[in-house]
Interface confidence: low
């Protein structure tokens, strides 16, 4: 192979290598490839020369494309008709010299933060593209609109992000940045100019038109005219408060909704009882004004008894049942119908099943001996106490039993 | 007896724009939820829009929020679905369903929507 | 949102067999608001159970569903050869609803 591989006239993207010819082999040597390393773990890579085309009776050869500020070794192959020959003993290490950064950093984004900041973030660039010592990231930004950048420099190569605070950086105003890396041999180009919002703050215009209904003994519907997006952030949501009439606003209960619905239901209230209701626009950074209040009062509670009475019959295939109606108390909610679950043997959970009368027909297979029936009333007010029966087939005919 | 028939699927360039119809009928529409759901081909199924009985209140998945729109027409018994900027990852078959107690309970066989350069 | 795992991914049984689905919520699923679907090739899907447990309209009894919180079974207790499908869960209790990416219960 080749020998005494020397690195002269080191450059930032180029060294001038020589070495001197090896044995032949007895048959002329036609031409040497050079390749270069990034020590200690690199793998050898062609590199590109000067001449292009390296002949055999040449002892030097400018590399070139290499990166500034990084460390190599080079070697030398030989080859002839018969073949390439084994490589030379790498050179020894040289390190490329400086030059300005000759990538702009990517990545480049942000936003978030507190009132008054406008958050900025990019990639860090790695080694490979410092070109040198020293190496920071000079960041340009501006309010979209505005003619002066202003500048700020972010030494250090891992820096990722920088903070402007500023009192007169107004909620959620565009600006318009961009970023260069630099190093002490210069900067290097600019990125594309990105658009990064300043932080938020809390929306300032309140819902209009809240509504709230009673639904049953527990729950209310709200709904509400929306805000507009306004100036301040990202609307994510609303934020009912509500609390019962007669209390002090600052005991409410709040539920938000998950995105931009103009109702929701509110649960868990306590039945017959007016509540005092108010909705908020939320974005990131809190909660805006209230709206004016709205009331609702709750539905006045299911009837406290159960459907009574209860009889069946069994067909081949159905089961009839029929019960008593419930008839409610002044202070009881209507009945409007009569839920019932079903649960034969065979299965560990029931079957849901409505009716607007005091009685039912459902299908069953014949093999089912008794089951487990469970009735209770419904309306306005929610669902009422149940009544559970074990119901059990007896040749067609029917029978009562006690709840 | 529940009838749902979805229309409007066809094959378009992504970034394009396309409305989905589904025609309901053997049921008080108004009074029912309705939902759109979706199934590329080969995969599974995913929720994309909801919308209330009376219209006023939408849902939407994230990967659609801000590109669809669902809406619907209680005098025609008709619910829609308009779609804007529409991406590859867009292409599957779309359902319209009424909602049953929450659940998607009654499903249209579905219309094919393409989306391809 | 509410991420659905189902398992297994493909369930191999003969018919008559007793057939057990499997579906966890990554977060508890508000009022048992799940659902399970039937899907056959070239069809659009068919409601099985809603509430967790109650059987839509028209679904035979062997088909039973059971859970709550973030744990959720369908059993198919007696496999019949229309029941070999792919079967998905769904949670619709709180907004996006997600659909568990389902399994598949094939003709051993």
């Known amino acids: 192979p080749p020998g005494g591989v020397v690195v002269r006239d080191i450059g930032d993207t180029t060294i001038q290598l020589s070495w001197s010819r090896g044995f032949d082999n007895h048959s002329p040597i036609a031409k040497y490839t050079l390749q270069a390393r990034t020590p200690p773990a690199g793998k050898w890579k062609q590199v590109r020369t000067n001449p292009a085309n390296i002949e055999g009776n040449a002892e030097t050869a400018q590399v070139l494309g290499l990166t500034p500020w990084m460390d190599y070794e080079f070697r030398v192959i030989a080859s002839n008709i018969l073949g390439t020959g084994e490589p030379s003993g790498p050179s020894s290490k040289i390190r490329t010299r400086e030059a300005a950064p000759s990538v702009a950093p990517s990545g480049l984004s942000g936003g978030g933060g507190a009132p008054g900041e406008l958050i900025v973030n990019w990639t860090p660039m790695s080694r490979e593209y410092q070109n040198g010592d020293g190496f920071g990231y000079l960041l340009s930004f501006r309010r979209q609109g505005s003619t002066h950048w202003q500048t700020a420099r972010v030494p250090g190569a891992d820096a990722q992000y920088f903070v402007y605070s500023n009192e007169s950086v107004r909620p959620y105003t565009p600006f318009e940045v961009k970023i260069r890396s630099y190093n002490r041999r210069g900067d290097g180009p600019e990125s594309l100019t990105a658009l990064v919002y300043s932080a938020e703050e809390e929306p300032r215009v309140a819902p209009t038109k809240v509504w709230a209904k009673g639904v049953s003994s527990s729950e209310m519907n709200v709904t509400w005219e929306p805000v507009q997006q306004d100036m301040n952030g990202i609307l994510l949501g609303y934020e009912i408060r509500y609390w019962k009439a007669g209390d002090k606003e600052a005991a409410a209960d709040r539920v938000r909704t998950a995105g931009l619905d103009t109702s929701a239901r509110v649960s868990g209230l306590h039945p017959n009882t007016k509540y005092h209701v108010t909705v908020r626009a939320y974005n990131r950074a809190g909660t805006g004004p209230a709206s004016p209040s709205a009331n609702a009062t709750t539905m006045k509670p299911p009837p406290r008894r159960p459907p009574g009475n209860i009889s069946w019959t069994f067909s081949s295939s159905s089961l009839s049942i029929k019960w008593d109606p419930v008839v409610p108390f002044r202070n009881e909610s209507a009945v409007t119908g009569y839920k019932m679950l079903y649960q034969n043997d065979l299965h560990l959970t029931p079957t849901l099943h409505l009716t607007g009368k005091n009685w039912i027909e459902i299908p069953v297979p014949e093999d089912i001996g008794h089951a487990l029936v469970q009735i209770r009333t419904t309306g306005p007010g929610g669902d009422g106490i149940p009544a559970e029966v074990h119901i059990v087939r007896n040749g067609g005919t029917s029978m009562m039993v006690e709840n | 007896q529940v009838h749902l028939v979805e229309s409007g699927g066809g094959l378009l360039q992504p970034g394009g724009s396309l409305r989905l119809s589904c025609a309901a009928s053997g049921f008080t529409f108004s009074s029912y939820a309705m939902s759109w759901v979706r199934q590329a081909p080969g995969k599974g199924l995913e929720w994309v829009s909801g919308i209330v009985g009376n219209g006023g209140s939408t849902y939407y998945a994230d990967s659609v929020k801000g590109r669809f729109t669902i809406s619907r027409d209680n005098s025609k018994n008709t619910l829609y679905l308009q779609m804007n900027s529409l991406r590859a990852e867009d292409t599957a078959v779309y359902y319209c369903?009424?909602?049953?107690?929450?659940?998607?309970?009654?499903w249209g066989q579905g219309t094919l929507v393409t989306v391809s350069s | 949102e509410i991420v659905l795992t189902q398992s297994p991914g493909t369930l191999s049984l003969s018919p008559g067999e007793r057939a057990t689905l499997s579906c966890r919520a990554s977060?508890?699923?508000?009022?048992?608001?799940l659902a399970w679907y039937q899907q056959k090739p070239g069809q659009a899907p068919r409601l099985l159970i809603y509430g967790a447990s109650s059987r839509a309209t028209g679904i035979p009894d062997r088909f039973s569903g059971s859970g709550s919180g973030t744990d959720f079974t369908l059993t198919i207790s007696r496999l019949e050869p229309e029941d070999f499908a792919v079967y998905y869960c769904q949670q619709y209790g709180s907004s996006p609803w997600t659909f568990g990416q389902g399994t598949k219960v094939e003709i051993k």
């Open positions: 369903a009424k909602l049953e107690w929450g659940a998607l309970g009654y």
């Open positions: 977060q508890s699923v508000s009022s048992s608001y």
